[in-house]
Amino acid sequence: VAQVSITKCSSDMNGYCLHGQCIYLVDMSQNYCRCEVGYTGVRCEHFFLTVHQPLSKEYV
């Protein structure tokens, strides 16, 4: 398994991840956002709500 060198993002990238943690993937020369639960998107900019549908009558 190839090891990936990671560190925190620089101050230059403050605010890059809207709802998540910014990680600097050194070997890939990329900033990466690790999103909080409920958020998605490159910069954790999209909120998604998982709606659990109640069981329909035929399953009751």
Epitope: S10, D12, G15, Y16, L18, Y24, S29, V42
Partner: antibody
Framework: QDQLVQSGAEVKKPGASVKVSCKAS????????IQWVRQAPGQGLEWMGR????????KYREKFEGRVTITADTSTNTAYMELSSLRSEDTAVYYC?????????WGQGTLVTVSS | DIQMTQSPSSLSASVGDRVTITCKAS??????IAWYQQKPGQAPRLLIQ???TLQPGVPSRFSGSGSGTDYTFTISSLQPEDIATYYC????????FGGGTKVEIK
């Protein structure tokens, strides 16, 4: 593949304004920051400022504050840099640079000549 | 603003020589420094980022080191195609370029 295509060369008179465009293809500018860098003939590289196209936030180098305006139109995936009150020392190649999802990725540059 | 002092501003060396360029930051930049090569009429080319990480396709004769405020860029064996101007860039807090080093062949 990913590209930043800048507008063509401009010749302006002292005191005028110039607006340089930077159109992205192959990626969404909302996923990045767009930086602007300039280089006067025979001189070094100078960072001017940047925009966060997703939120519209801008940061400028102090010496350009009040004279430069960086904007972005996410519907056309294009960033802009407008410099006003031009003087001869503003003659330079202006570059847009993507950062964020890729460390640095440069446009081809736009030559702006300020001459009376 | 963070200032980046790059030295020397120019140097002349023979093919095969070891070439060293330094950049000193006005404050700790936490290893967030990149090195660029620029040839006349071309956009800068990224060689190294995060102090020492070589970009894909960049020859191993190029290297970088340092920490805190002091950083070094080295060409272990100068080649004719290395004739260019080299710039450091800090990206810890916004961005600042060093003044550049013009490398020529003796």
């Amino acid at each position: 593949q990913d590209q930043l295509v800048q507008s063509g060369a401009e010749v302006k008179k002292p005191g005028a304004s110039v607006k340089v465009s930077c159109k992205a293809s192959g990626f969404n500018i909302k996923d990045t920051y767009i930086q602007w860098v300039r280089q006067a003939p025979g001189q070094g590289l100078e960072w001017m400022g940047r925009i966060d196209p997703l939120r519209g936030n801008t940061k400028y180098r102090e010496k350009f504050e009040g004279r430069v305006t960086i904007t972005a139109d996410t519907s056309t995936n294009t960033a802009y840099m407008e410099l006003s009150s031009l003087r001869s020392e503003d003659t330079a190649v202006y570059y847009c640079v993507r950062s964020g999802t890729l460390f640095d990725f440069w446009g081809q540059g736009t030559l702006v000549t300020v001459s009376s | 603003d963070i200032q980046m002092t790059q030295s020397p501003s120019s140097l002349s060396a023979s093919v095969g020589d070891r070439v060293t360029i330094t950049c000193k930051a006005s404050q700790d930049i936490h290893k967030y420094i990149a090195w660029y090569q620029q040839k006349p009429g071309q956009a800068p080319r990224l060689l190294i980022q995060y102090t020492s990480t070589l970009q894909p396709g960049v020859p191993s004769r190029f290297s970088g080191s340092g920490s805190g405020t002091d950083y070094t860029f080295t060409i272990s064996s100068l080649q004719p195609e290395d004739i260019a101007t080299y710039y450091c860039l800090q990206y810890d807090n916004l961005r600042t370029f060093g003044g550049g080093t013009k490398v020529e062949i003796k």
